[in-house]
Interface confidence: low
């Protein structure tokens, strides 16, 4: 029997425009088989990606895919930047494409920016 490979689905060059002060959930869509992988989020700082150890995360399960969620409660101005999720799964260390948060400070926002909810499917596969 073939082993099941973990797959992370984040759209290439995905972006989210969000408002400081609001709650926000950043989703890492994960497909896995026999064992759920250990998934972590990191924030890009130059060429390195700094693991977000102490941030609140959770899993959301749907029929054909799972989501590893990074919670922003609330969004802060310095949350602006690029994020990546990675899965450590036995024989694989898999990293997603980066996804960028554009944070608008509520003090300077004249109107609420639209959000890219990553609703378009299928996502581009990154393995």
């Amino acid at each position: 029997k073939e082993s099941c490979d973990v797959q992370l689905y984040i759209k290439r060059q995905s972006e989210h425009s969000i408002l400081a002060g609001d709650p926000f959930e950043l989703e890492c869509p994960v497909k896995y088989c026999a064992n759920r992988p250990h998934v972590t989020w990191c924030k890009l700082n130059g060429t390195t990606c700094v693991k977000l150890e102490d941030r609140q995360t959770s899993w959301k399960e749907e029929k054909n895919i799972s989501f590893f969620i990074l919670h922003f409660e609330p969004v802060l101005p310095n949350d602006n930047g690029s994020y990546r999720c990675s899965a450590n799964f036995q024989s694989n260390l898999i990293e997603s494409h980066s996804t960028t948060l554009y944070v608008t400070d509520v003090k300077s926002a004249s109107e609420r920016p639209s959000k890219d909810e990553m609703a378009s499917r299928p996502w581009l596969l990154y393995r």
């Epitope: 490979d5 064992n35 759920r36 250990h38 799972s66 036995q90």
Partner: antibody, heavy 118, light 111 residues
Framework: QVQFQQSGAELARPGASVKLSCKAS????????IQWVKQRPGQGLEWIGT????????RENQKFKGRATLTADKSSSTAYMQLSSLESDDSAVYYC???????????WGQGTLVTVSA | DIVLTQSPASLAVSLGQRATFSCRAS??????????INWFQQKPGQPPKLLIY???NQGSGVPARFSGSGSGTDFSLNIHPLEEDDTAMYFC?????????FGGGTKLEIK
């Protein structure tokens, strides 16, 4: 083929520490999680924790939190478990194991017997 | 923590017959359409050997005599036909969530 060579039997006093080793061969050490499992004589199995040698990431059973320290040395392809503040209940065989694509526990070491006695 | 209860504690079955082992979880170990249960065989002085993963899939090199079934909280391992070499302890494991937990085991004796 995938193999693990675990260190030899240990005799330790209560309150002391032991450091067990698990030398891996036959695969890329940094690519696979290493699990540690405890088995008391004639009893069941208990998961202690796991380490990803690639970056040192660990997940631990809270029951062993603070007493079991998992580390890995990439240069020698060896995983270590240090168990501190030993008690008589820590007398057991300790196994290291590795997964494949389907289970976290597909390959096992031969085990190390730890005896805690005054 | 998820508690796994295995029954019976010991089992004596005649050569060539069927042995059935039960493993019951304190809560569902299903996730993403998969049952996160593994079955292991352990002989004296040896480490456990993986028999079944994801409740019903045979591990590498495991004979077709070994089969697993179940979902949610109730799982079983079947061996048929029994061979002399099957005398061992059998354990279930859940990997649905950390800490991973094992059942207490069932000892199989061939009559």
């Amino acid at each position: 083929q995938v193999q693990f060579q675990q260190s030899g039997a240990e005799l330790a006093r209560p309150g002391a520490s032991v450091k067990l080793s698990c030398k891996a061969s036959g695969y890329t050490f940094t690519d696979f999680w290493i699990q540690w499992v405890k088995q008391r004589p004639g009893q069941g199995l208990e998961w202690i924790g796991t380490i990803y040698p690639g970056d040192g990431d660990t997940r631990e059973n809270q029951k062993f939190k603070g007493r079991a320290t998992l580390t890995a040395d990439k240069s020698s392809s060896t995983a270590y478990m240090q168990l501190s503040s030993l008690e008589s209940d820590d007398s057991a065989v300790y196994y290291c194991a590795r997964g494949n694509g389907n289970s976290w526990f597909a390959y096992w070491g031969q085990g190390t017997l730890v005896t805690v006695s005054a | 923590d998820i508690v796994l209860t295995q029954s019976p504690a010991s089992l004596a079955v005649s050569l060539g017959q069927r042995a059935t082992f039960s493993c019951r979880a304190s809560e569902s170990v299903d996730d993403y359409g998969i049952s996160f249960i593994n079955w292991f065989q352990q002989k004296p002085g040896q480490p456990p050997k993986l028999l079944i993963y994801a409740a019903s899939n045979q591990g590498s090199g495991v004979p077709a005599r070994f089969s697993g079934s179940g979902s949610g909280t109730d799982f079983s391992l079947n061996i048929h036909p029994l061979e002399e070499d099957d005398t061992a302890m059998y354990f279930c494991l859940q990997s649905r969530e950390i800490p991973y937990t094992f059942g207490g085991g069932t000892k199989l004796e061939i009559k």
